[in-house]
């Protein structure tokens, strides 16, 4: 019987409201055995893939996507999917990244923690377009 792949989760560190010029890391999580995580921006046409997967726990894997210096253009909706051979998962919920004018620096107290269930989360659409398998080496229009 074919495995049902759980939906991935997405979160952001240190949060989802980031001062201009500060860094943010998107964290995608899925089950063990994930080979590729993909971070999608707004739509599927813009994404970044990584095979730099780590084992977050005996039952969970994760990948981290870092933006070193956030620009206004980085604001928007992000979501994750993953490839666990031989299938791609569904998308995670959307997470919205907000970029604000720098006032209190990167450790400003009003930086909201990013969470897969947080207030900036939006449900993903339910479309199920085919994703290219990782083995096809599809080129990404990079996010950053």
């Amino acid at each position: 019987q074919e495995e049902d792949l759980p939906r991935p989760s997405i979160s952001a560190e240190p949060g989802t409201v980031i001062p201009l010029g500060s860094h943010v890391t998107f964290v995608c999580r899925g089950p063990v055995g994930v080979q590729t995580f993909r971070l999608e921006r707004d739509s599927r046409s813009t994404y970044n893939d990584t095979e730099d997967v780590s084992q977050a726990s005996p039952s969970e894997s994760e990948a981290r996507f870092r933006i070193d210096s956030v620009r206004e253009g980085n604001a928007g909706l992000y979501r994750c999917i993953y490839y666990k051979p031989p299938k791609w998962s569904e998308q995670s919920d959307y997470l919205e990244l907000l970029v604000k004018e720098s006032s209190g620096g990167p450790d400003s107290p009003d930086t909201e923690p990013g969470s897969s269930a947080g207030p900036t989360q939006r449900p993903s659409d339910n479309s199920h377009n085919e994703h290219a398998p990782a083995s096809q080496g599809l080129k990404a229009e990079h996010l950053y």
């Epitope: 019987q1 074919e2 089950p31 055995g33 080979q35 095979e51 997967v53 084992q55 051979p85 031989p86």
Partner: antibody, heavy 121, light 108 residues
Framework: EQSLEESGGDLVKPEGSLTLTCTAS?????????ICWVRQTPGKGLEWIGC????????TYYASWAKGRFTISKTSSTTVTLQMTSLTAADTATYFC?????????????WGPGTLVTISS | ELVLTQTPASVSAAVGGTLTIKCQAS??????LAWYQQKPGQPPKLLIY???YLASGVSSRFKGSRSGTEFTLTISDLDCDDAATYYC????FGNGHTFGGGTEVVVK
């Protein structure tokens, strides 16, 4: 205890064909594993042949050199076969089947002891 | 086609010492790399998966690490039982589950 065992190794003439069988004990190929074949020529290194997904999709995945001449099939809930055609002396090797599991990120945590295939006239 | 270049092809080290085996991938495979130990007449035994994670039941004297496309297996406090041939393997489905050429380890 979970184990794999290969069978079917034999002495075959050049240009001949042979089918090897990998049999599972203590678990079923109905679970979501990749069952893979690897060979080792005498005194040489390991050479990956290909894999089949034991889930219902039955996806297969081959080394480029093996496509067309080697075919991996799931024949029952406990057996996977490797069909080999147009065999030459270069195919003389010990053939292993191995299991790739998600919890070891598709590396091969379980191997059979191997079966010897000799191609000679 | 992915090539994994393992170095050295053979190495000799003393009991109690430390040795390092390297595996260079010709393409990006991320962390999708495993290390195996094989002794004569036996199938390979999984040591390390996902570049740096120790397989169940394997001694913590074995350590895997990665820097870009270069992977390293380090064996510390060498034991006579560590004499074997060691192989790296890509577990990346896009590039093929290729094996490195192997490193024969002799323990003196």
């Amino acid at each position: 205890e979970q184990s794999l065992e290969e069978s079917g190794g034999d002495l075959v003439k050049p240009e001949g064909s042979l089918t090897l069988t990998c049999t599972a004990s203590g678990f079923s190929f109905n679970s979501n594993y990749w069952i893979c074949w690897v060979r080792q020529t005498p005194g040489k290194g390991l050479e990956w042949i290909g894999c089949i997904y034991s889930g219902s999709s039955g996806d297969t995945y081959y080394a480029s050199w093996a496509k067309g001449r080697f075919t991996i099939s799931k024949t029952s809930s406990t057996t996977v076969t490797l069909q080999m055609t147009s065999l030459t002396a270069a195919d003389t090797a010990t053939y292993f089947c191995a299991r790739g599991a998600d919890y070891v990120y598709w590396s091969y945590g379980l191997w059979g002891p191997g079966t010897l295939v000799t191609i000679s006239s | 086609e992915l090539v994994l270049t393992q170095t050295p092809a053979s190495v000799s080290a003393a009991v109690g010492g430390t040795l390092t085996i390297k595996c260079q991938a010709s393409e990006t495979i991320g962390t999708n790399l495993a290390w195996y130990q094989q002794k004569p007449g036996q199938p390979p035994k999984l040591l390390i998966y996902l570049a740096s994670y120790l397989a169940s039941g394997v001694s913590s004297r074995f350590k895997g690490s990665r820097s870009g496309t270069e992977f390293t297996l380090t064996i510390s406090d060498l034991d006579c039982d560590d004499a074997a041939t060691y192989y790296c393997q890509s577990t990346h489905f896009g590039n093929g589950h290729t094996f490195g050429g192997g490193t024969e380890v002799v323990v003196k």
